[in-house]
């Protein structure tokens, strides 16, 4: 179960492992997702994170035992929020109302060096990554992918 | 239970290594990144670093570079901290701790081993 | 490196005194600011995480708050079992790094 409000929010510039960044650009009455070199003084689009807390259950490993996770929406402009869009294995920006649907939470990872990955809350082992100059959903099948660079990204407040 | 249980307590010469062993059990091992801290006789709190079971990818306190060695063993759920070039300084008890969420160091450390005395004396 | 500069070092107190401990860092760390409370021989035990958030099991008389830079740790009724030292930890990058300790004495 995922809080109904979040324990904190964060506003940050989100860029990839190599330093890319992440642009959302208005087109068309929607809203595109790059990921780009910017120019020396380009200014960085922000996304609001907004973390919650989650009881996760006991896993089928048989450890029976329950387990906090952190999950995280994030908003690069009012109303709109990053969805995975698991048919396609494509991330899109939706408008929506709270309460958000399960498809806009991702399960926080933050455990290689100071980079964060972004795994589907409603399709567990899919995270959110970068492919093509695009963000798009990664299936990743091992322990050792994890630390695989195009899933890894950093937030910075500059 | 969840539990962090660790090795017993060492006496090294200088210039000697140490290998602290932390046994977890109770929860989903590779969930959880582990966290390695050590506090010195009287003193305060002092973080040397994190392994990650998963993958088994760490990172390291600069002052510890070089001289820590964190590994874990997925089949028996245990994670090790190996010291070298041990010095008087290094004469602490070390602990092992888990962060309280998955995947995540976010939301603070808490579970804790009961600590490791290791004392350096020539 | 984030510095974490924990004050008073230590305070003397009474049973049912308020005791407030405070934690600056030197960056700002957003929420991401645990609380310990650690007893001579025992390993620290985790009071309040993201700043405010009580951890399971700990009693409400603790509370914390602030965010970015400054941070507080508040023992409302100051009880028998809470004489013990108190340290913050910022959560937000590696190295974590804690405070230098706060050792609330009986007076």
């Known amino acids: 179960i995922t809080g109904i409000s979040p324990i904190t929010e964060y506003l940050a510039s989100l860029s990839t492992y190599n330093d890319q960044s992440i642009t959302f650009a208005l087109e068309d009455e929607s809203y595109e997702i790059y990921v780009e070199d910017l120019k020396k003084d380009e200014k960085k689009d922000k996304v609001l994170l907004s973390y919650y807390e989650s009881q996760h259950p006991s896993n089928e490993s048989g450890d029976g035992v329950d387990g906090k996770m952190l999950m995280v929406t994030l908003s690069p402009t009012k109303d709109f929020w990053l969805h995975a869009n698991n048919k396609e294995h494509s991330v899109e920006l939706h408008k929506c109302e709270k309460p958000l649907p399960d498809q806009a939470f991702f399960v926080l990872h933050n455990m290689h060096s100071n980079c964060v990955s972004f795994e589907c809350k409603t399709d567990p082992g899919v995270f959110i990554g970068v492919k093509d100059n695009h963000l798009a959903l990664i299936k990743v099948d091992s322990s050792e992918n994890l630390c695989t660079e195009n899933i890894l990204f950093k937030l910075s407040e500059t | 239970q969840v539990q962090l249980v660790q090795s017993g307590a060492e006496v090294k010469k200088p210039g000697a290594s140490v290998k602290v062993s932390c046994k977890a059990s109770g929860y989903t091992f590779i969930s959880y990144g582990m966290h390695w801290v050590r506090q010195a006789p009287g003193q305060g709190l002092e973080w040397m670093g994190e392994i990650n079971p998963h993958g088994g990818s760490t990172s390291y306190a600069q002052k510890f570079q070089g001289r820590v060695t964190m590994t874990r063993d997925t089949s028996t759920s245990t994670v090790y901290m190996e010291l070298s070039s041990l010095r008087s300084e290094d004469t602490a008890v070390y602990y092992c701790?888990?962060?309280?969420?998955?995947?995540?160091?976010?939301?603070?450390?808490?579970?804790w081993g009961r600590g490791t005395l290791v004392t350096v004396s020539s | 490196d984030i510095q974490m500069t924990q004050s008073p070092s230590s305070v003397s107190a009474s049973v049912g005194d308020r005791v407030t401990i405070t934690c600056r860092t030197s960056q700002g760390i957003s929420s991401w600011l645990s609380w310990y409370q650690q007893k001579p021989g025992k390993a620290p035990k985790l009071l309040i995480y993201a700043a405010s958030s009580l951890q399971s099991g700990v009693p409400s008389r603790f509370s914390g708050s602030g965010s970015g830079t400054d941070f507080t740790l508040t023992i409302s009724s100051l009880q028998p079992e809470d004489f013990a030292t108190y340290y913050c930890?910022?959560?937000?990058?590696?190295?974590?790094?804690f405070g230098g300790g706060t050792k609330v004495e009986i007076k």
């Open positions: 930890q910022q959560a937000h990058v590696l190295p974590l790094t």
């Open positions: 701790a888990r962060p309280s969420a998955a995947y995540s160091h976010y939301l603070g450390i808490d579970l």
